[in-house]
Amino acid sequence: SIPWNLERITPPRYRADEYQPPDGGSLVEVYLLDTSIQSDHREIEGRVMVTDFENVPEEDGTRFHRQASKCDSHGTHLAGVVSGRDAGVAKGASMRSLRVLNCQGKGTVSGTLIGLEFIRKSQLVQPVGPLVVLLPLAGGYSRVLNAACQRLARAGVVLVTAAGNFRDDACLYSPASAPEVITVGATNAQDQPVTLGTLGTNFGRCVDLFAPGEDIIGASSDCSTCFVSQSGTSQAAAHVAGIAAMMLSAEPELTLAELRQRLIHFSAKDVINEAWFPEDQRVLTPNLVAALPPSTHENLYFQ
Amino acid sequence: GAMGQEDEDGDYEELVLALRSEEDGLAEAPEHGTTATFHRCAKDPWRLPGTYVVVLKEETHLSQSERTARRLQAQAARRGYLTKILHVFHGLLPGFLVKMSGDLLELALKLPHVDYIEEDSSVFAQ
């Protein structure tokens, strides 16, 4: 049966026993800045082009053992959430991956900047349709990373990022705090903010909306047909990147402001239990869970 | 995220290094009254001292970025410091990425076209 997260973002009219908008997102290219990925996994084969971009720091620890499947784990899962054949949101979207996170899931602001610059140069050399950039990563507040995101957004690129998994104000992190970026927090099947160990999803006024981010089934790099459940604001951001790809595929001329407005408009309102957030953050945190547009857009989204 | 907010620095550290009066033989002095600023990550364990993004003013051309980077290297060498230009930015932001001692920050902030300098820091999969 349909995984809970796909059911949650699907308008009631389409809740059959399977989720299948066949060409959702087919006019859009989604860039993923993450770990390396297993691009020939059955769930994503042929959908993800691994670019030759790689800018990662060395792994910590002298006895670190680099295991390919672990190195690929985070990125493979997210690529599957965005565009996977069976458990993906935008099954028609094509993706390009850039490696900016090492096998321990760690990267640098500078490596991410160079990655964003690579995307801009690719866009200039070979202009295609709408671009979505997924940044499933977070660091401390960075003026330069936010500035680069702002420039890319002004060039017509839609940037989607994880709010962060620090149970903290997202405004203290980048790129989550960049105003031009769509920043996504994570909720679970009960529409509760996601708890991750002693921490959890970030919150606050720098978050634009929430999306499913707990127990999300997606491609596992353990084997070419494996699936695994992962949680985090990265998974939530991947849902919104997929939804954005479908919206832009249906309406390629949408501006960032219009897309953001549509994402908010079609979100489920006031379903999140705000008691989880610190009292002073409740009024600042948007009570919105991302969803696809309803049946009025049938011809656009499910053609 | 969330458009419409004013810039939020949180407890982000901004260190404004005052420019000294002696100019160190620069052909082009920075514009009068502008002070380049230095930024670093507020979360200490995430800091990566020794690598810096030197961000130049918005309309700076690639050739000027390269020239500024070379000038920094030359002035650092005169003081006995080794530096390495890791990347020259253009396309999104003008500037360059440099591996150098933190002792050179004061010097770097005086370079022409410099808007601000940010110490590199870590980002993490979420």
Epitope: E18, Q20, P22, Q38, S39, D40, R42, E45, G46, V48, M49, V50, A68, R85, D86, K91, C223, S224, T225 | -
Partner: antibody, heavy 115, light 109 residues
């Protein structure tokens, strides 16, 4: 254009081994593995397994476990399928196809096992 | 892995429509969005006609269409032509592998 070119026909004795090659071109190798499919005379298609150009990982059909080995050589863009301890019922046309989606096929390699 | 069930043969006259069914279980056809259909002429390699239940690769005529309901997938060929005479195989993901149908011989009368 996307192409898979297979090695020529083979005649083998029972108990012997055969190694069929499949050279891929015209696409990004690491975005797809290679599936191997066989078809005995007058019979249907049988999926034998899959091998990765990305990391060499394999996924064998249960029936093949132990007797077959699939490998790739990314430097020559070539995938290989070796079948050991051949029996007469291994006589078939062996196809390679691109990925699990099997959207592009090789021309086929006839393997005849006969004493 | 037992093969998916297809009718051994179907036939139709030129211009007519025919449908070939492919029945599996919830562990294969019913559980995945990845049912494919292949056409094979005698002595030739199979050719992909439909992928992911209902999508047509470029170059395949829109006379060919695919659908799925529950554990059964179907291939429909409308406006039947002489060159459509061939063997047709369905294929589906299973949890760890791939499984083909036994094949259907289409005769154009």
């Amino acid at each position: 254009q996307v192409q898979l070119v297979q090695s020529g026909a083979e005649v083998k004795k029972p108990g012997a081994s055969v190694k069929v090659s499949c050279k891929a071109s015209g696409y990004t190798l690491t975005s797809y593995g290679i599936s191997w499919v066989r078809q005995a005379p007058g019979q249907g298609l049988e999926w034998m397994g899959w091998v990765s150009f990305y990391n060499g990982n394999t996924n064998y059909a249960q029936k093949l476990q132990g007797r077959g080995t699939m490998t790739t050589d990314p430097s020559t863009s070539t995938a290989y399928m070796e079948l050991r301890s051949l029996r007469s019922d291994d006589t078939a046309v062996y196809y390679c196809a691109r990925g699990y989606g099997m959207d592009v096929w090789g021309q086929g390699t006839t393997v005849t096992v006969s004493s | 892995q037992s093969a998916l069930t297809q009718p051994a043969s179907v036939s139709g006259s030129p211009g007519q429509s025919i449908t070939i069914s492919c029945t599996g279980t919830s562990s294969d056809v019913g559980g995945y969005n990845s049912v494919s259909w292949y056409q094979q002429h005698p002595g030739k390699a199979p050719k992909l006609m439909i992928y992911e239940v209902s999508n047509r690769p470029s170059g395949v005529f829109n006379r060919f269409s695919g659908s799925k309901s529950g554990n059964t997938a179907s291939l429909t060929i409308s406006g039947l032509q002489a060159e459509d005479e061939a063997d047709y195989y369905c294929n589906s993901y299973t949890s760890t592998s791939m499984v083909f149908g036994g094949g259907t011989k289409l005769t154009v009368l």
